[in-house]
């Protein structure tokens, strides 16, 4: 396993401003199709505000107006739904505020009574606004591969909306999933859009598909379940991540690291730095600076991505995603190349190369 000399000396080079993360549930703004929506970025003392939607930079267009701390969406459509963020860049730090936009004419019930056969637990939606099924939060469904230790329980969820309220059924490896297909069967809770399998065994491995449908359409989503027979291992990092990246001065870049670990992993982003003109200490170990580490309130989503905004030449170099658990440490590295700013718009490219 690798050894590192972590640099604590803050006089090395200008520190990246610390980033504050919002740890509460994002606020949800609801609009009906065709309506206009105005949201104010709830950050104080914002010198410069940048906006993103679903992690992608958001610029003004014929329907999106960005004025100071306000975002206006004119004539909203369902495609405007998603996770938005405004980031206030200040001299000493940057802060990001997240919020959800849900453009829908469907208002679903919050009824949580226990059910046996499903759909009657929902209050019917506005009968004038028919709508095919849709996922209420696609971002939470991004992770498709799930490794669960044998003898534990797995819960698959596919929260959806639609009008009339859709029904849900489950497939295993593309075929109807029946209770008799596994010892102990499974449990479904339609009001939570969930399927639970208790005490999983290796024969439960496979693809599980939720099919959500009403008379106006059908959608489906597949999760892959891997049942891990316990042989403790250090964290596994997804091959190819983080990927090498390049950007121009002033641009933004992000590195992504996907970590799989049965034991609770501790994840850090580290930059290889120089001290007194050298990348290595007298012991031959690299000088490193911890840029970001998982805290008690840090979500998987937050720690898996390292954002570097308003890149300078000093940001160029090697970045390492390091994950450790009680068994050991794994790490992948990637390089950031910073190019001079041309007269045109900044560009970001990424290649799948990585170093281990």
């Amino acid at each position: 396993r690798p050894s590192f000399s972590l640099v604590e000396d803050t006089t090395l080079e200008p520190e990246e401003p610390p980033t504050k993360y919002q740890i509460s549930q994002p606020e949800v703004y609801v609009a009906a199709p065709g309506e206009s929506l105005e949201v104010r970025c709830l950050l104080k003392d914002a010198a410069v505000i940048s906006w993103t939607k679903d992690g992608v930079h958001l610029g003004p267009n014929n329907r999106t107006v960005l004025i100071g701390e306000y975002l206006q969406i004119k004539g909203a459509t369902p495609r405007d739904s998603g996770l938005y963020a405004c980031t206030a860049s200040r001299t000493v730090d940057s802060e990001t505020w997240y919020f959800m936009v849900n453009v829908t004419d469907a208002i679903s019930s919050g009824d949580d009574e226990d059910d046996t056969d499903g759909a009657e637990d929902f209050v019917s939606e506005n009968s004038n606004n028919k709508r095919a099924p849709y996922w209420t939060n696609t971002e939470k469904m991004e992770k498709r591969l799930h490794a669960v230790p044998a003898a534990n329980t797995v819960k698959f969820r596919c929260p959806a909306g639609g009008n009339p309220m859709p029904t849900m059924r489950w497939l295993k490896n593309g075929k109807e999933f029946k209770q008799e297909h596994r010892i102990g069967g499974y449990k479904v809770r339609n009001q939570h859009w969930s399927l639970i399998m208790e005490s999983v065994v290796p024969s439960d491995k496979g693809n599980y598909t939720c099919v959500v449908e009403n008379e106006y359409g059908s959608i489906n989503h597949t999760y892959h379940l891997d049942v891990v027979e316990r042989s403790p291992h250090r964290p596994i990092l997804q091959a190819g991540l983080p990927a090498n990246a390049s950007t121009v001065v002033g641009g933004d870049v992000e590195f992504v690291c996907k970590v799989y670990s049965d034991a609770q992993p501790h994840i850090q982003w580290i930059k290889h730095v120089e001290k007194n003109g050298s990348k290595y200490g007298p012991d031959g170990l690299p000088y490193l600076k911890v840029l970001k580490a998982a805290g008690v309130n840090t979500t998987d989503k937050e720690i898996e991505v390292l954002y570097i905004r308003n890149v300078t030449f000093e940001d160029a170099g090697e970045y390492t995603c390091l994950a450790g658990n009680s068994i050991g440490i794994s790490f992948h590295s990637a390089w950031l190349t910073v190019l001079p700013a041309p007269g045109r718009e900044k560009e970001i490219t990424a290649s799948p190369d990585y170093l281990e």
Epitope: M141, K143, P149, A151, F156, R189, I196, R230, A263, T299
Partner: antibody, heavy 127, light 107 residues
């Protein structure tokens, strides 16, 4: 049949130490976890900590962090709660409970459920 | 820490009554909530997990519902063996926390 049997409780002076044992049988020991929960006389339940028997990872309540240590001997199917620097407020019945995870694919957290409990062992901290 | 508040703290009921106990979390715990039953001098027993899933071997007169911050345990027809103290417990946040308990007594 799943069984958990605690032992090791007793009277100890403030500042003293005690080690509780939880002997488990009837389930694949290294697949799941053991939690310790305590109950002061006439009071409610308080979670103390948890270990995952497969990888040895542990979590503790703030009130015991740095004083209590959870460990396990998988060859003996036994979990332990080592209690140091004991205080009067640690007086309670201590339960061990088999703990399994519900892995939520949507919110990506693990819900921990304690489904089998031992009979409890009383720890009294008094001078 | 996430605070769990149960109400009522105690209640008196008769055999055959429908009993409802509520549990409120100080912040969103999704559906990561369990209910336990404890008789005096005995260890707790798991009744419900993931807010609404009945644990194996638990009579179907017990049911759970709710998500987010508000949860309910319902006993549809109280039986003599149901007189006990009931606890809710969340485990989505660290540390896991229990409610203060609801004592169900014979009227």
């Amino acid at each position: 049949e799943v069984q958990l049997v605690e032992s090791g409780g007793g009277l100890v002076q403030p500042g003293g130490s005690l080690r509780l044992s939880c002997a488990a049988s009837g389930f694949p020991f290294t697949s799941q976890g053991i939690s310790w929960v305590r109950q002061a006389p006439g009071k409610g339940l308080e979670w103390v900590g948890r270990t995952h028997l497969g990888d040895g990872s542990t979590n503790y309540a703030d009130s015991v962090k740095g004083r209590f240590t959870i460990s396990a001997d998988t060859s003996k199917n036994t979990a332990y709660l080592q209690m140091n620097s004991l205080r009067a407020e640690d007086t309670a019945v201590y339960y061990c409970a088999r703990t399994y995870g519900i892995y939520d694919t949507y919110d990506k957290y693990t819900e921990y459920v304690m489904d089998y409990w031992g009979q409890g062992t009383l720890v009294t901290v008094s001078s | 820490d996430i605070q769990m508040t149960q109400s009522p703290s105690s209640l008196s009921a008769s055999v055959g009554d429908r009993v409802t106990i509520t549990c409120r979390a100080s912040q969103d715990v999704d559906t990561s909530l369990a209910w336990y039953k404890q008789k005096p001098g005995k260890a707790p027993k798991l009744l419900i997990y993931s807010a609404s899933f009945l644990y194996s071997g638990v009579p179907s007169r017990f049911s759970g519902s709710g998500s987010g911050t508000d949860f309910t345990l319902t006993i549809s027809s109280l039986q003599p063996e149901d007189f006990a103290t009931y606890y809710c417990q969340q485990s989505t946040g660290h540390p896991q926390t229990f409610g203060q308990g609801t004592k169900v007594e014979i009227k």
